[in-house]
């Protein structure tokens, strides 16, 4: 016996009824008595609903089923669910035997739309540029879990500091709370968008904030133009520094420094004291140094990760940023050379060196020359890995014919650090033994 | 009417740089971003990054940043793009467009006519 | 990054018929643009914030979404509709384009 239920998911709103299709063909001369229907819940085989008997034996789910009794003679097998609600979601199979037996199971998706977000600040008085605010977007009653995106008010993502929670209630429906710590800019809107994934409904919200702004005219932020660059392991000093008017105290000072790209916080000097490291404990300011301008950051046991861009924003009556660029180097080893096959070697003998050397940032350029210093670019393959530390290990394979003998040497560059380590290996023309037995 | 006006294609030795220009007019400048798109003969559209005129704030694709420099000029209403040390790799039609909408939904409403780059030894 | 993968990469059609391209992203996406760019022009928009028709163009473009994947419809093909149709995205950085779905006449 053939059963119909449609493929997709049936979608209802908590609070209305459903209606779950299925459908049968009677033949001619079906009557009522000679069918069974059953409704069950697909995983758990609770029974739903039943027609034996020639009769509607009646709803065993909360009395809040029914079926459409007019319509079943012709095939109509469906089921009427009330008043759902987010525990209703699932899969429901439909049994239908007559002589013959046949089954389908249909999927229930519950969804509630989202309320409108609203928007509150914090702080939310007496706001300057440079200030940090935590800005909430907070919507209501909806199912299922929502996403949550944040833009500015240019229409870019804006994606760090953003924490999202999400809690059910005693109903099941989802409030959602997002929270975006940002650093205030001279003015902007911020915007969060609550997305129902199952009713592809958008609620968004949206919060300007003007902060006051003095008429002394913007803070000079000044920052090196070239990027900082820095040893892996080694301490780097990413400096900015502003010129304090006469009559400035350390009171009157908000410091942040953030990632440029993610908006991270990194570091932060506000309310006359220092905030501390937000960054790994591995960041320190130059406190005796602030009163006079320097408002720089010192970064501690430099990572490939920290590599990117660093804003310093500084404000006092007004507010001033610049972002300053850190470049992350590691020298590569003394390159090691291997030879293969490296016994017997004659004239003629296609041979195999490779080049290694290890643990360099960022990924190196490698050179390959003769004896004479033309280089040999034919049959080389250069590979590079990086480690958990971001660190490469760079492996360059040369496959070339001996001549009577030669010397073929491989030169390893750090692009940054503008540094060459090199190795060579001789071959000579007699057969002989790699590397050379003492 | 809305427009944004290019500069004439440049054709550029490996390893030198140029400068484009996009000029905005039919509209206020500052208030809203500026992005530039590569289009490489034959292939599809790649994102280089923006500026917002008001605040000078540039953002960009990791894979463009090294090479490229974004500015504006607000006195004049006209965007700039400097791409430096150039390869045949940057042989492209480099669009600016307008990035425009309502919060929280934006798109590019306005595109220039595209500055042909050809790198050529 | 958010990757926009769209298919097919070519599609032929002839007038009248009813086609549909994808465009899949590889995560959650706050809305999708998409634009239609003819041999030696400029792109120009074409549906915006997910499912809204920039100026100008034609009802017979429609869009619909199921998860991460958005379709666009046209239900029946004209001449001037030949194109390449460009998804993109900027819920995160960076914005991103798809490689484009090539419609071709018949």
């Known amino acids: 016996l053939e059963v119909q239920v449609p493929e997709d998911p049936v979608v209802a709103l908590v609070g209305t009824d459903a209606t779950l299709r299925c459908s049968f063909s009677p033949e001619p001369g079906f009557s009522l008595a000679q069918l069974n229907l059953i409704w069950q819940l697909t995983d758990t085989k609770q029974l739903v609903h039943s027609f034996t008997e020639g009769r509607d034996q009646g709803s065993a789910y909360a009395n809040r089923t029914a079926l459409f009794l007019d319509l079943l003679a012709q095939g109509n097998a469906s089921l009427r669910l009330q008043r759902v609600r987010v525990a209703d979601e699932g899969s429901f199979t439909c049994f239908v035997s007559i002589r013959d037996f046949g089954s389908a199971a249909v999927s229930l998706q519950v969804a509630a739309p989202y309320s409108k977000p609203s928007m509150t600040l914090e702080p939310n008085k007496d706001l300057r540029p440079g200030d940090t605010v935590t800005i909430t977007c907070s919507s209501y009653r909806g199912y299922p879990e929502a996403e949550v995106f944040w833009q500015d008010g240019q229409g870019a993502p804006l994606t760090g500091n953003v924490t999202t929670s999400q809690m059910a209630n005693e109903q099941g429906l989802f409030d959602v709370h997002s929270v975006l710590r940002v650093v205030l800019g001279a003015n902007g809107t911020y915007s969060c968008l609550v997305r129902n994934p199952v009713l592809q409904q958008d609620a968004h919200g949206s919060i300007t904030i003007t902060p006051q702004r003095s008429p002394t005219g913007a803070v000079e932020v000044q920052v090196p133009e070239d990027p900082v660059v820095a040893l892996v392991g080694t301490d780097a000093t990413l400096r900015c520094s502003f010129s304090p008017e006469p009559g400035f105290s350390l009171a009157q000072l908000n410091l942040i420094w953030q990632l440029t790209d993610t908006k991270q916080l990194v570091h932060s000097f506000t309310e006359g004291r220092d905030q501390g490291s937000a960054y790994a404990n591995r960041t320190a300011l130059f406190l005796d140094l602030l009163a006079q301008g320097n408002a720089s950051l010192r970064l501690q046991r430099v990572r490939v990760a920290d590599e990117g861009s660093f804003t310093c924003f500084v404000s006092i009556r007004d507010f001033g940023s610049a972002a300053v660029s850190l470049q992350v180097a590691a020298p590569y080893s003394k390159p090691s050379m291997t030879l293969e096959p490296n016994k017997d070697l004659r004239p003629g003998d296609t041979v195999t060196i490779t080049c290694s050397s290890y643990r360099g940032y960022p990924e190196a350029e490698v050179f390959w020359q003769d004896g004479q210093g033309a280089p040999l670019t034919g049959n080389v393959t250069t590979s590079q890995m990086a480690n958990e530390q971001g660190l490469f290990d760079v492996h360059s394979v040369l496959r070339v014919v001996l001549g009577a003998n030669g010397t073929y040497s491989c030169l390893v560059r750090n692009p940054v650090l503008q540094q060459d380590a090199h190795g060579s290996v001789t071959i000579t023309g007699q057969p002989m033994t790699f590397p050379p037995e003492a | 009417q809305v427009q944004l006006q290019q500069s004439a294609a440049e054709l550029a030795r490996p390893g030198a740089s140029v400068k484009m220009s996009c000029k905005a007019s039919g509209y206020s400048f500052t208030s809203y971003t500026i992005h530039w798109v590569k289009q490489r003969p034959g292939q599809g559209l790649e994102w280089i990054g923006y500026i917002n005129p008001n605040s000078r704030n540039t953002d960009y694709n990791q894979k463009f940043k090294d090479e490229t420099t974004l500015t504006a000029d607000r006195s004049s209403s006209t965007a700039y793009m400097q791409l430096i040390s150039l390869t045949s790799e940057d042989s492209a039609v480099y669009y600016c467009?307008?990035?425009?909408?309502?919060?929280?939904?934006?798109?590019?409403?306005?595109w220039g006519a595209g500055t042909t780059v050809t790198v050529s030894s | 990054q958010i990757v926009l993968t769209q298919s097919p990469a070519i599609l032929s059609a002839s007038p009248g018929e009813k086609v549909t391209m994808t465009c899949r992203a590889s995560?959650?996406?706050?809305?999708m643009n998409w634009y239609q760019q003819k041999p030696g022009s400029s792109p120009k928009p074409w549906i915006y914030a997910t499912s809204n028709l920039a100026s100008g163009v034609p009802a017979r473009f429609s869009v619909s979404v199921s998860g991460t994947s958005h379709s666009l419809t046209i239900s029946r093909v004209e001449a001037e509709d030949a194109a390449t149709y460009y998804c993109?995205?900027?819920?995160?950085?960076?914005?991103?384009f798809g490689a484009g779905t090539k419609l071709e006449l018949k």
């Open positions: 467009a307008r990035y425009s909408g309502s919060t929280p939904y934006w798109y590019f409403d306005v």
């Open positions: 993109q995205q900027w819920s995160s950085n960076p914005l991103t």
């Open positions: 995560s959650s996406v706050s809305y």
